[in-house]
């Protein structure tokens, strides 16, 4: 039994890091393998992660972390019984994938303005709370070409757009994702999408 693709890990910079790897053949990850991880810190202890299958030869493990700070470094040991298959390390702050925003809501009752709001996925005491920026994706269910991205580079989790920038009388969907420039993170997953019917009064034309 050998590791074909070494583990790569990403952290949500809060409580979970996810590591994925591939074996050289079909593997029952949960029964055959264990990933041991330990914070390099005074009086820390090793923890065991039981991996799950992720495709035939792929494995994934969700590492639970007490909290995360920028200096953190973890040792990782992948075991098959008594055999050490791979040894490595992981610095969560260098491999951050933020949590997805939640509670995306479209407020349509604000005088021909659409107000989209969502929740920051981090608590106020987490470093990322004040460092997230967002991308909002809006698309038409009827017209695949009607697809747009709005970059929200301020901290407030909201976006205002004129209803008239979208077509009237049809349904739209929106979703939002986040990233943090400070840690050069990847984008989060998209939030669940929300749907609304776009309608607004056409401006009265004077002749």
């Amino acid at each position: 039994m050998k590791v074909l693709q070494e583990p790569t890990c990403v952290s949500d910079y809060m409580s979970i890091s996810t590591c994925e790897w591939k074996m050289n053949g079909p593997t029952n990850c949960s029964t055959e393998l264990r990933l041991l991880y330990q914070l390099v810190f005074l009086l820390s202890e090793a923890h065991t992660c039981i991996p799950e299958n992720n495709g035939g030869a792929g494995c994934v493990c969700h590492l639970l972390m007490d909290d995360v700070v920028s200096a953190d470094n973890y040792t990782l040991d992948l075991w098959a019984g008594q055999q050490l298959l791979w040894k490595g390390s992981f610095k969560p702050s260098e491999h951050v994938k933020p949590r997805a925003p939640g509670n995306l809501t479209v407020h349509t009752n604000v005088s021909d303005t659409l107000l989209l709001t969502w929740s920051n996925p981090y608590p106020p005491d987490n470093y990322l709370y004040n460092h997230l920026t967002y991308a909002v994706n809006i698309w038409s269910e009827n017209d695949p070409a009607d697809f747009r991205i709005y970059n929200v580079t301020y901290l407030e989790p909201s976006l205002r757009i004129a209803a008239s920038t979208l077509k009237s009388g049809i349904s739209y969907r929106a979703r939002v994702r986040a990233w943090a420039q400070c840690y050069n993170t990847t984008w989060s997953e998209w939030s669940p999408s929300t749907k609304w019917h776009n309608s607004y009064r056409e401006p009265f034309e004077q002749h």
């Epitope: 810190f41 005074l42 820390s44 202890e45 090793a46 007490d66 909290d67 700070v69």
Partner: antibody, heavy 120, light 108 residues
């Protein structure tokens, strides 16, 4: 309420032994690294020793290494410090301390302290 | 072993004034590992700041921490009578724990 209560201090002769205890309440001891910190009369704080949540690892200041032993009884929510070959310079108030998160984050819960006097 | 040096040894100020206490490490340390404590006579120390700048539960916002590398600061923006005490900085690091020698903040 989260509390730590030390006991076992007293007067002991140089070269003697003493065992300090710390009873934890209001939280699960097994979830935290725990420590002993001391303060000699009129002096500053000095770190003494620490122990990991399941006793897998321990750490000692150089000044007590080989003479003091830290241990814990998680089911009884109690921390111990066995002190032997005591010296006059070990005279201090000994505090039992919990860290804010599992291993770190500052020491957020302190006991009221127990006084150890080493004198002939 | 990293040594923490606090200055000044004693700081004499009046209520309402701003207090700035310094802690210098003998070598660079992570901001995650620096904490500040307050101790009043006959009492156990109390955690004020951890992770250089994060206030512990229940600590008033007149207390703030800052710094990086080797130089760290505890600032009390407007001194209240109950703030006069001894303050300690602490390194709680990946391989050791040490305290500074303390700064006594006294009423002028």
């Amino acid at each position: 309420e989260v509390q730590l209560l030390e006991s076992g201090g007293g007067l002991v002769q140089p070269g003697g032994s003493l065992r300090l205890s710390c009873a934890a309440s209001g939280f699960t001891l097994s979830s935290y690294a725990m420590h002993w910190v001391r303060q000699a009369p009129g002096k500053g704080l000095e770190y003494v020793s620490g122990i990991s949540p399941s006793s897998a690892s321990t750490y000692y200041a150089n000044s007590v290494k080989g003479r003091f032993t830290i241990s814990r009884d998680n089911p009884k929510n109690t921390l111990f410090l066995q002190m032997s070959s005591l010296r006059a310079e070990d005279t201090a108030v000994y505090y039992c301390v919990r860290v804010k998160s599992k291993y770190r984050g500052g020491m957020d819960v302190w006991g009221q302290g127990t006084t150890v006097t080493v004198s002939s | 072993e990293i040594v923490l040096t606090q200055s000044p040894g004693t700081l004499s100020l009046s209520p309402g004034e701003r207090a700035t206490l310094s802690c210098r490490a003998s070598q660079s340390i992570s901001t995650a590992y620096l904490a500040w404590y307050q101790q009043k006579p006959g009492q156990a120390p109390r955690l004020l700041i951890y992770g250089t700048s994060r206030r512990a539960t229940g600590i008033p916002d007149r207390f703030s921490g800052s710094g990086s590398g080797t130089d760290f600061t505890l600032t009390i923006s407007r001194l209240e009578p109950e703030d006069f005490a001894v303050y300690y900085c602490q390194l709680y690091g990946a391989s050791s724990v040490t305290f500074g020698q303390g700064t006594k903040l006294e009423i002028k």
